[in-house]
Amino acid sequence: NFMYSKTVKRLSKLQEYQQYYPSLTCVMEGKDMEDWSCCPTPWTSFQSSCYFISTVMQSWTKSQNNCSVMGADLVVINTKEEQDFITQNLKINSAYFLGLSDPKGWRHWQWVDQTPYNKNVTFWHSGEPNSPDERCAIINFRSEEWGWNDVHCHVPQKSICKMKKIYI
């Protein structure tokens, strides 16, 4: 009976999310394998988040709006492990917008989700950021490694969206 009511709850939650995400990929989690964590298909999952690589070339503002429509934000990178996971799925000859910007050009970088910008957990390429005119951050492959670079916000790039996993 308990299992039945849990299944009914899950089904109703799935139906609720289905209006936003036509398909979800879920895995069982938790010590009793009773919780399901889901990401929209074909998003990828890492720890408690889902990631989507958009190959549509758009400005930073349009890229953030695009993520927002999907219930996400441009990606906020919190650890080297997270960056390493993300870059496994990126093309080395492309650049991708991050959810990091400096809208006033004061070198006060800010994440879209208001996560505090921690200079000690940043992955700028050597010599970057290098221009107060360039107020948005991308991740690209340079000098044999993935890192961040400041660029003009209105120049279209690919982008990475991030959202919290859906738990049902």
């Epitope: 107020r135 916000c153 209105h154």
Partner: antibody, heavy 121, light 111 residues
Framework: EVQLLESGGGLVQPGGSLRLSCAAS????????MSWVRQAPGKGLEWVAT????????YYPDSVKGRFTISRDNSKNTLYLQMNSLRAEDTAVYYC??????????????WGQGTTVTVSS | DIVLTQSPDSLAVSLGERATINCKAS??????????VNWYQQKPGQPPKLLIY???NLESGIPDRFSGSGSGTDFTLTISSLQAEDVAVYYC?????????FGGGTKVEIK
């Protein structure tokens, strides 16, 4: 006072090349992103190229990509536009302009007087 | 590309009267409370001159009879009291996304 002086325009045959220069003074050129904008005779304005202050990032519309190259020499306070494989539709007055960021966008705040490029056989 | 459509193509206004120029974008050029539309004035034989940036901010040194308004996809440049020296072509421009694009221009003349 900001001054931008374009030069290098002239008459060139289709398929030919030309290099435009823009000599800048009255501001710290090396800290400014710069752009070229053109205006065909009796027509409107068309953005042609942009280069960041350090010269390591350049941007072009599809209409000139692969044919035009923007560059700069910060030691000479000069902006350049190398134009190859010129076509009749490249005939225009070419202006250089300073770029000023505005949050996530920008404005072109100072413009030179322009130099005329005519592509004709 | 973002297309900007200006109207009217030309406008004849009496001295001291109001002139209004419209600019419609093919998609929104707003983000986080700012609109990325600029207005330029071009007099015959001269380069363009920046009048308004961010849809409504008056550039330094520009007379306050010029004003800009609008958001999203619809923008307006207003000259509250037309002066003889305002005879020119006026262009809107978007800087939200490359390629930067300009409207086709509106020619303002004295009636």
């Amino acid at each position: 006072e900001v001054q931008l002086l374009e030069s290098g325009g002239g008459l060139v045959q289709p398929g030919g090349s030309l290099r435009l220069s823009c000599a800048a003074s009255g501001f710290t050129f090396s800290t400014y992103t710069m752009s070229w904008v053109r205006q065909a005779p009796g027509k409107g304005l068309e953005w042609v190229a942009t280069i960041n202050s350090g010269g390591d990032n350049t941007y072009y519309p599809d209409s000139v990509k692969g044919r035009f190259t923007i560059s700069r020499d910060n030691s000479k306070n000069t902006l350049y536009l190398q134009m190859n494989s010129l076509r009749a539709e490249d005939t225009a007055v070419y202006y250089c302009a300073t770029y000023r960021p505005y949050y996530y966008g920008s404005v072109l705040d100072y413009w030179g007087q322009g130099t005329t490029v005519t592509v004709s056989s | 590309d973002i297309v900007l459509t200006q109207s009217p193509d030309s406008l004849a206004v009496s001295l001291g009267e109001r002139a209004t120029i419209n600019c419609k974008a093919s998609q929104s050029v707003d983000y986080d409370g700012n609109s990325y539309v600029n207005w330029y004035q071009q007099k015959p034989g001269q380069p363009p001159k920046l009048l308004i940036y961010g849809a409504s901010n008056l550039e330094s040194g520009i007379p306050d009879r010029f004003s800009g308004s609008g958001s999203g996809t619809d923008f307006t440049l207003t000259i509250s009291s037309l002066q003889a020296e305002d005879v020119a072509v006026y262009y809107c421009q978007q800087s939200d996304e490359d390629p930067w694009t300009f409207g086709g221009g509106t020619k303002v003349e004295i009636k």
